[in-house]
């Protein structure tokens, strides 16, 4: 807390300017009017205040707006945003995308802090859903943003927003998240033709079911091995050797290098060795000729 002391003669601030950086903490408290500060917040960011001085300025705003700052002030917080706690931010009502961008800019190039996470949460909840413009903005600042959301949160993403997603935005998503995003992507891109559709849907295929992979195998898509390795194991297992060969096209040769890794390893174990041999890749571990394969899951379902 800064003690209440009278402002020395001639030091009363008429405007927020660089002369204030030479004020001591008690002088800032005594000589800067909170209402003046609020109306000239846009100047604060251009002045190299110390963090101690920023604490004083924050204290003045807190006294002026005990219920939370108005958006006109929030938009111009600049470096003062670095002084806010998640508790402060929960009092705010941020509705403008411009305000969100201005505050994200302050933290640009740095990891997402609890303050930024709280700000984003408040903003998205206020909007009711993650619309395309918001998603565009958030992934521009934090490419991993989408994958930081829970499957429940992702369910509020409208299919139209999927157009804003770039492949790198999905790099850290796990299968549960892709399970939610894939159907939305499929819906978003449904009116595109074959090759264009595949380019757009490719990043989301970690959530694709078997039937969709079978359909893709009929379209000469030439899926690369990196994409294939991210597919759900349970979606890959039912694919035949012929379907995988069509799905991968010229990339099928890459299976040999991945034969010890999932999902390739598990898929090999489900194929007849005869069928694997037709690929001419030397893949081993398939079901020997003459063996009968019982699908126990089917048997359990019948009994």
């Amino acid at each position: 807390e800064v003690e209440k002391t009278a402002c020395p003669s001639g030091k009363k601030a008429r405007e927020i300017d660089e002369s204030l950086i030479f004020y001591k903490k008690w002088e800032l408290e005594a000589c800067v009017d909170a209402a003046l500060l609020a109306t000239q917040m846009d100047r604060v960011n251009a002045i190299p205040f110390t963090y101690e001085q920023l604490d004083v300025l924050k204290h003045k705003l807190d006294e002026l707006y005990p219920q939370g700052y108005p958006e006109s002030v929030i938009q111009h917080l600049g470096y003062l945003f670095l002084k806010m706690s998640p508790e402060d931010i929960r009092k705010w009502n941020v509705t403008s995308l411009e305000t969100l961008k201005a505050l994200l800019e302050v933290n640009k190039g740095h990891e997402m802090s609890p303050q930024v996470a709280t700000l984003i949460d408040r903003f998205v909840k206020g909007r009711g859903q993650l619309d395309k413009d918001t998603l565009d903005t958030l992934t521009a600042f934090y490419p991993g943003y989408l994958c930081s959301l829970s499957p429940e949160e992702l369910s509020s993403v409208p299919p139209s927003s999927i157009w804003a997603v770039r492949p790198q935005d999905l790099d850290t998503c796990d299968p549960r998240q892709l399970d939610v995003l894939y159907p939305k992507a499929r819906l978003a891109f449904q009116n595109m033709n074959g090759s264009e559709y595949f380019v757009k849907i490719q990043s989301f295929l970690g959530g694709a079911p078997t039937e969709d992979l079978k359909a893709l195998s009929q379209q000469n898509v030439s899926m690369d091995l990196a994409t294939f390795m991210k597919l759900r194991t349970d979606a890959v297992l039912p694919l035949t050797v012929a379907e995988v060969q069509k799905l991968l096209g010229p990339h099928v040769e890459g299976l040999k290098a991945e034969e010890r890794h999932r999902p390739v390893r598990d898929w090999i174990l489900r194929q007849r060795q005869d069928d694997l041999d037709t690929l001419g890749l030397g893949l081993q571990g398939g079901i020997p000729n003459g063996y009968l394969v019982l699908d126990l899951s089917m048997q359990e379902a019948l009994s």
Partner: nanobody, 119 residues
Framework: QVQLVESGGGLVQPGGSLRLSCAAS????????MRWYRQAPGKGLELVAT????????YLGSVKGRFTISRTNAKNTLLYLQMNSLKPEDSALYIC????????????WGQGTQVTVSS
């Protein structure tokens, strides 16, 4: 963490010049603004000059036109204070300060270098 080490202080006659240096090491990419403070015996800490992260310089009224603050953002961040037309009242311990970006942001201080202006 940021470490700051000052050098360049000494005894100089009134009207003379000195150039103070402050070498920063550690997490220098996170440095935001850098400053020179001074503290005369029995007095409080006084901000002398600031150079902001965009290179803008700000000076205490009594040193304006005589002192120049500058900063290099090379591998080794260096802060300088060129002091010309020195006066006895400029005698003090000159201390380098840097603050870093982040939540909540931190202030770092050097040990200081002594400047004495006397005939």
């Amino acid at each position: 963490q940021v470490q700051l080490v000052e050098s360049g202080g000494g005894l100089v006659q009134p009207g003379g010049s000195l150039r103070l240096s402050c070498a920063a090491s550690g997490s220098i990419s996170s440095i935001r603004h850098m400053r020179w403070y001074r503290q005369a015996p029995g007095k409080g800490l006084e901000l002398v000059a600031t150079v902001s992260n965009d290179g803008s310089a700000y000076y205490l009224g009594s040193v304006k036109g005589r002192f120049t603050i500058s900063r290099t953002n090379a591998k080794n961040t260096l802060l300088y204070l060129q002091m010309n037309s020195l006066k006895p009242e400029d005698s003090a311990l000159y201390i380098c300060n840097a603050d870093t970006w982040g939540w909540p942001g931190a202030d770092y201080w050097g040990q200081g270098t002594q400047v004495t202006v006397s005939s």
